[in-house]
């Protein structure tokens, strides 16, 4: 049996091409060590889009060449993506991991549709 | 029953606040003069955003003042509406009458979720 | 607000000939093609005439077909219905309908006697 | 002769729920044509409450629904109330006679 994973069914990426959305698990116990993975789904594919561990103690830590950024309160990891372009358009599935203490447990969203659109761009000054 | 009319799920506009999407309709025998109606839906309530009767031989013509602009062919109509806003963001559906000569008939796409970004202001130029 | 109001009802002998008009306001008239719709009270309703937004094309039903002559002056937001040769089965309300249905005018009364 | 046969009076209660039917043939109602409804008071035009077999004009409560199955459309008026009370009227287009047909009308009567 899975683990109940849930995030909004879509988002629209902001003109500078950032979206937020919140990734809210069940949380079965005390976890103290929590994964969360961005994947990309295209048709059958699923691509990774950024990972972070956390523990309930600390802050989010996404890589510092990631364009995800995250913050996490109790069971609810508020997540950012950055550097969107409109070919980024797609559906972003949040992946939770209780890595410890035993058990593991899994589970998937079923998926955030973020709409991205480009900006038009800005006229040359003189 | 009643005339199926066909629409795109969703639509993004463009980052100048145009939307364009396609309305098509299921026709039933030889309709010489269409009205085509775009509705937003807002929880209960409908308002009508533009509408335009055109001919089958003729272009499709919106009123002056009209956002929505477009063209027909057969039994398709392409549909543009113009000057959006973020919080213009909502469901839009295509109302299809065939009013003439009779019978009368009509349908009502399922809607089409138009989202919108405003864009970021651009710097000014020293 | 939507209105529709017809004008030229009368008495008239059978074989006379009589012009009825309804003004249209509130809408777009030129953009909706329209219909004269009857009632008389032992045959009921019955759509009489019918003719698109330009005025180009007409419809009649049977009963009415080389008496009577659907017209429109999108200027004046006008809908006319000549009926000519009139019979006492012509004797009814007339109503003024948009074609889908979505208004009436209050109708005017014709009634075909000698 | 009304093509369409609808019952000539229903009666119900305040507050209740009603249905009148409209029957016709394959070549009218059975035949996929829309069907619409009116309402008509004495003495005053007709009111098209459905069009196009379920749809409400607005301003007409939700109170009032339509369906249509076979040869058979039906006007559904729930939680009646006194103004309700009125004649009834169905149309469809007839292919065979390239006409619309209209039903006869049901006098609609609220007791209590």
């Known amino acids: 049996k899975g683990m109940h994973v849930a995030q909004p069914a879509v988002v629209l990426a902001s003109s500078r091409g950032v979206a937020s959305f919140v990734c809210e698990y069940g949380s079965s116990g005390n976890a103290a060590e929590v994964r969360v993975t961005v994947l990309r789904q295209a048709g059958s594919q699923m691509t990774e889009v950024c990972a972070a561990t956390y523990t309930v103690e600390d802050e989010l830590a996404f890589l510092d060449d990631s364009t995800c950024t995250g913050t996490s309160s109790g069971n609810k990891v508020n997540l950012t993506i950055q550097g969107l372009r409109a070919m980024d358009t797609g559906l972003y599935i949040c992946k939770v991991e209780l890595m410890y203490p035993p058990p593991y447990y899994v589970g998937m969203g079923n998926g955030t549709q973020i709409y991205v659109i480009d900006p038009e761009p800005c006229p040359d000054s003189d | 029953k009643g005339m199926h009319v066909a629409q795109p799920a969703v639509v993004l506009a463009s980052s100048r606040g145009v939307a364009s999407f396609v309305c098509e309709y299921g026709s039933s025998g030889n309709a010489a003069e269409v009205r085509v109606t775009v509705l937003r839906q807002a929880g209960s309530q409908m308002t009508e955003v533009c509408a335009a009767t055109y001919t089958v031989e003729d272009e499709l013509a919106f009123l002056d003042d009209s956002t929505c602009t477009g063209t027909s062919s057969g039994n398709k109509v392409n549909l543009t509406i113009q000057g959006l806003r973020a919080m213009d963001t909502g469901l839009y559906i295509c109302k299809v009458e065939l009013m003439y000569p009779p019978p009368y008939y009509v349908g009502m796409g399922n809607g089409t979720q138009i989202y919108v970004i405003d864009p970021e202001p651009c710097p000014d130029s020293d | 607000e939507v209105q529709l109001v017809e004008t030229g009802g009368d008495l008239m002998k059978p074989g006379g000939s009589l012009r009825l008009s309804c003004v249209a306001s509130?809408?777009?008239?030129?953009?909706?093609?329209m219909s004269w719709v009857r009632q008389a009270p032992e045959k009921g309703l019955q759509l009489v005439a019918g003719i698109n937004s330009g005025g180009s094309s007409t419809y009649y039903t049977d009963a009415v077909k080389g008496r009577f002559t659907i017209s429109r002056d999108n200027a004046k937001n006008t809908l006319y219905l000549q009926m000519n040769s009139l019979r006492d089965e012509d004797t009814a309300v007339y109503y003024c309908v948009i074609s889908n249905w979505s208004y009436w005018g209050q109708g005017t009364l014709v009634t075909v006697s000698s | 002769q009304p093509v369409l046969t609808q019952p000539p009076s229903v009666s119900a209660a305040l507050g209740q729920r009603v249905t009148i039917s409209c029957t016709g043939t394959?070549?009218?109602?059975?035949?996929?044509?829309?069907v619409q409804w009116y309402q008509q008071f004495p003495g005053r035009p007709p009111k098209t409450i459905i069009y196009g077999n379920y749809n409400r004009p607005s301003g007409v409560p939700d109170r009032f629904s339509a369906s249509t199955s076979g040869t058979t459309a039906t006007l559904t008026i729930s939680g009646l109330q006194a103004e309700d009370e009125a004649n009834y009227y169905c149309s469809s287009w007839d292919n065979s006679l390239t006409a619309y047909v209209f039903g006869s009308g049901t006098q609609l009567t609220i007791l209590g």
């Open positions: 509130g809408f777009t008239f030129s953009s909706y093609s």
């Open positions: 394959a070549t009218n109602v059975g035949g996929g044509y829309d």
